[in-house]
């Protein structure tokens, strides 16, 4: 299967971990498939929920992925780049705060450039409840990690804010920042940030980034 949409269409409609295959390759990767939300078929490319996984990782780790697909994890920039350059994908970002509120941002067009172009993110067609301005800077920026500084700031955003992300200088979001528990999650410049929903210092409780073909 190329993605969770193909898994779903084959009759596997239960949430869980499935083995996907890189486009035009035999290389495999394990991903969590959400087969319930919004019609199912979602490939989860990022999840934060409890702080159990360190997201301050190297370029290579963000390239190939890390963590546990059933819990906190990053699927891998290379797979996502290859996948989203095959056809049109949508990206949905689901967010939870510490007060029981949920919100989402949906981008109707999403792809990552190749590693040669630093996995630059491209997003269009924003809708949703997590802000009418995109908290991922538009146009998209190159991906940066602690050992791969591609942001627009002399400050090295990934080291300062922690985590790999499409930093601007440093920009209004970072879903791969430090995980802060409840009552320690405010006034945190390096937390899990989605500015146009909760502001600059609020660190979120949980985040999920998921993709699905636009024609699903």
């Amino acid at each position: 299967f190329r993605d969770c949409a193909e898994v779903f269409k084959s009759g596997h409609t239960t949430n869980g971990i499935y083995t996907l295959t890189f486009p035009n390759s035999t290389e495999e990767i394990k991903a969590y498939c959400d087969m319930e939300a919004g019609g199912g078929g979602w490939t989860i490319i990022q999840r934060r929920e409890d702080g159990s996984v360190d997201f301050q990782r190297t370029w290579k780790e963000y390239k190939v992925g890390f963590g546990n697909p059933s819990g906190e994890y990053w699927l891998g920039n290379e797979f996502v780049s290859q996948l989203t350059n095959q056809q049109r994908y949508v990206l949905k970002i689901h967010l939870k705060d510490w007060e029981g509120n949920e919100a989402y941002s949906l981008y109707e067009h999403f792809y990552l450039s190749s590693e040669e172009l630093n996995y630059r993110i491209h997003l269009k067609g924003l809708t949703g409840t997590a802000g009418k301005i995109s908290s991922i800077s538009q146009p998209g920026n190159d991906f940066s990690t602690k050992d791969g500084d591609n942001d627009k700031c002399i400050c090295k955003c990934s080291q300062m804010l922690t985590g790999g992300w499409w930093f601007d200088a440093c920009g209004p979001s970072n879903l791969n920042g430090m995980y802060y528990p409840q009552r320690q999650n405010t006034a945190k410049f390096n937390g899990i940030k989605w500015y146009y929903w909760k502001g600059s210092g609020y660190s979120l409780k949980a985040t999920t980034m998921m993709i699905r073909p636009a024609d699903f």
Partner: antibody, heavy 121, light 107 residues
């Protein structure tokens, strides 16, 4: 710096084909983004005609779909416009431009200087 | 196709004035709206994209705002070199479409 330059005949006869070339320097058209043709009619109205993406896929304005073809020569870093069965209503200044997005229509950040095409017998 | 209705068609202003141009989309264009400046004899130049993001090197007197169907472009303090035609463009749905243009003339 990215630069785009249109070239082609300034005069085309009705019912013939219009062929234009856009030569890109400073960026590989196979790396990223979409590469567009836009025209501006007398009176300044702008019309998007179509694009060829870095991956080679194309998208056309439905109003032109039966007449238009956009192709490329990656070895020369050029892309081309062919518009068939032209009429005097196709008289315009033709621009090539780069989109800020690679898989869909988008705003355009780099434009050529434009080439004027008159359709007349 | 989404129709972009741009108003006004002509703006006659003095240097130092603040000017506002509006574009109304016939259906939602999300935040996928750009604004261009075209000076006489030149090609269009991108000023604003994603409704409110200033393109690289564009002076901060140029601003954009809006979401959905209503979009606004403003020049806070008009300068003589701002003499041009200004166009809005939606690229939320294909084909992308342009407004009819606003000609800015300096008194």
């Amino acid at each position: 710096d990215v630069q785009l330059q249109e070239s082609g005949p300034g005069l085309v006869k009705p019912s013939q084909s219009l062929s234009l070339t856009c030569t890109v320097t400073g960026y590989s058209i196979t790396s990223d983004y979409a590469w567009n043709w836009i025209r501006q009619f007398p009176g300044n109205k702008l019309e998007w005609m179509g694009y060829i993406s870095y991956s080679g896929s194309t998208s056309y304005n439905p109003s032109l779909k039966s007449r238009i073809s956009i192709t490329r020569d990656t070895s020369k870093n050029q892309f081309f416009l062919q518009l068939n069965s032209v009429t005097p209503e196709d008289t315009a200044t033709y621009y090539c431009a780069r989109s800020t997005f690679g898989h869909y229509v988008s705003s355009m950040d780099y434009w050529g200087q434009g080439t004027s095409v008159t359709v007349s017998s | 196709s989404i129709v972009m209705t741009q108003t006004p068609k002509l703006l006659l202003v003095s240097a130092g004035d603040r000017v506002t141009i509006t574009c109304k989309a016939s259906q939602s264009a999300s935040n996928d709206v750009a604004w261009y400046q075209q000076k006489p004899g030149q090609s269009p130049k991108l000023l604003i994209y994603y409704a409110s993001n200033r393109y690289t090197g564009v002076p901060d007197r140029f601003t954009g705002s809006g979401y959905g169907t209503d979009f606004t472009f403003a020049i806070s303090t008009v300068q003589a070199e701002d003499l041009a035609i200004y166009f809005c463009q939606q690229d939320y749905s294909s084909p992308p479409t342009f407004g009819g243009g606003t000609k800015l003339e300096i008194k």
